[in-house]
């Protein structure tokens, strides 16, 4: 069985996550990367992914989420701006290495985003919500549709445990078939 | 619970280099990035790089291109940062820092005691 | 290179409340960090992700941000609270801004 690790993120509204998935980077440095949201009972849907071959330290913007890959780091930084609520959910990184399927990097990130003020919770309502103006589009790249021998007919089960600590993990075990990730748009 | 302790102070004459010490306990050593960070006297903090434990790469500032070197023994779960061609500048605290989770670059939560390196003829 | 701007000192009188900003370009994308440091002690994280407090950090401790500027605020600042204080943000490479230092009067 494949263990499975989440790090939780809750968030405002208007706020941005901000994250790095490692890659190793001799293997993957000019591989094609994506970001997946999983949903329960689907299959994991790429939301945006960088140009193939990925650049060098190019922001590729798609929406609200920003990818930038740093070859130099082995890391993929992925930025989502002016979170919403219905941005909560399950995510991950993937490395595009056809013909095989997508690599998928550790650990997943699971998103909470709550309505309410950007501000301390407990300080002082009037504070200002921040609510970030989007600059236009950099770069759109196209993400490739991948079809698999094996699907994953259900997403891993979403956890019950409370995770409030920044260092708490969710460990998901007996998770089989995880690693094979078809890819949507 | 996390500890992150660094090796003692140093006297350097310029030209030297010196290398400090910063020994992780706590957690599992390869999951985090372990920074560092100095403070000169009257000055800021000053970020200086950061290494990847699990992968042994490390991303240094601009500043510090060609006379920082960060490596790590993983064996006894300890991180290094070597800084070369010492001048009076380099005078300051230098503290190694660890990243709060494994899926983010900053804040740093946990901070090494640390080292005191003086360089003086 | 990104540079990230704090005003270079803040006076308040005990029980007062003390704000200190820090602002650079596109600080709305990006989640920042603050540290307290005092004389012969090493960094204390006491707010991340824009707004939170780590555990051990007293509530009069808060952090906003608006569009690019976030700002640290002390409410009911006491004397133990004169240090130095640090923004953080990562850009393509981890940024402090200058410091701001805290005189409690």
């Known amino acids: 069985a494949t263990k499975l690790t989440e790090e939780k993120y809750e968030l405002k509204e208007g706020q941005t996550l901000d994250v790095k998935c490692d890659y190793t980077l001799e293997k993957f440095a000019s591989s094609q990367k994506a970001w997946q949201i999983i949903r329960d009972g689907e299959m994991p849907k790429t939301l945006a992914c960088t140009e193939r071959p990925s650049k060098n330290s190019h922001p590729v913007q798609v929406g609200r989420i920003i990818l930038e890959d740093y070859h130099d780091h082995g890391l993929l930084r992925v930025r989502m701006v002016n979170l919403q609520v219905e941005d909560s959910g399950l995510y991950q990184c993937v490395i595009y290495q056809p013909p095989k399927e997508p690599h998928m990097l550790f650990d997943r990130i699971r998103l909470v985003v709550t309505k309410g003020f950007s501000g301390t919770p407990g300080s002082n309502e009037n504070s200002t919500q921040n609510v970030y103006k989007i600059p236009p589009t950099t770069t759109k790249a196209l993400c490739p549709l991948y079809t698999s021998p094996r699907t994953v007919t259900q997403a891993p089960p979403k956890s019950t445990a409370d995770v409030s600590t920044p260092d708490s993990e969710i460990n998901l075990t007996n998770v089989t078939d995880i690693i094979r990730v078809p890819v949507f748009n | 619970q996390v500890q992150l302790v660094q090796s003692g102070a140093e006297v350097k004459k310029p030209g030297a280099s010196v290398k400090v010490s910063c020994k992780a306990s706590g957690y599992t050593f390869n999951g985090y990035y372990i920074h560092w960070v100095r403070q000169a006297p009257g000055q800021g903090l000053e970020w200086m790089g950061w290494l990847n434990p699990n992968s042994g790469g490390a991303n240094y500032a601009q500043k510090f291109q060609g006379r920082v070197t960060m490596t790590r023994d993983t064996s006894i779960s300890t991180a290094y940062m070597e800084l070369s061609r010492l001048t009076s500048d380099d005078t300051a605290v230098y503290y190694c820092?660890?990243?709060?989770?494994?899926?983010?670059?900053?804040?740093?939560?946990?901070w090494g005691q640390g080292t005191l390196v003086t360089v003086s003829s | 290179s990104y540079e990230l701007t704090q005003p270079p000192s803040v006076s308040v009188s005990p029980g007062q409340t003390a704000s200190i900003t820090c602002s650079g370009d596109k600080l709305g994308e990006r989640q920042v960090s603050w540290y307290q440091l005092k004389p012969g002690q090493s960094p204390v994280l006491v707010i991340y992700q824009d707004n939170k407090r780590p555990s051990g950090i007293p509530e009069r401790f808060s952090g906003s941000k608006s569009g690019n500027t976030a700002t640290l605020t002390i409410s009911g600042t006491q004397a133990m609270d004169e240090a130095d204080y640090y923004c953080q943000a990562w850009d393509r490479n981890v940024v402090f801004g200058g410091g701001t230092k805290l005189t409690v009067l």
């Open positions: 820092a660890r990243d709060q989770r494994k899926t983010t670059v900053t804040p740093f939560e946990y």
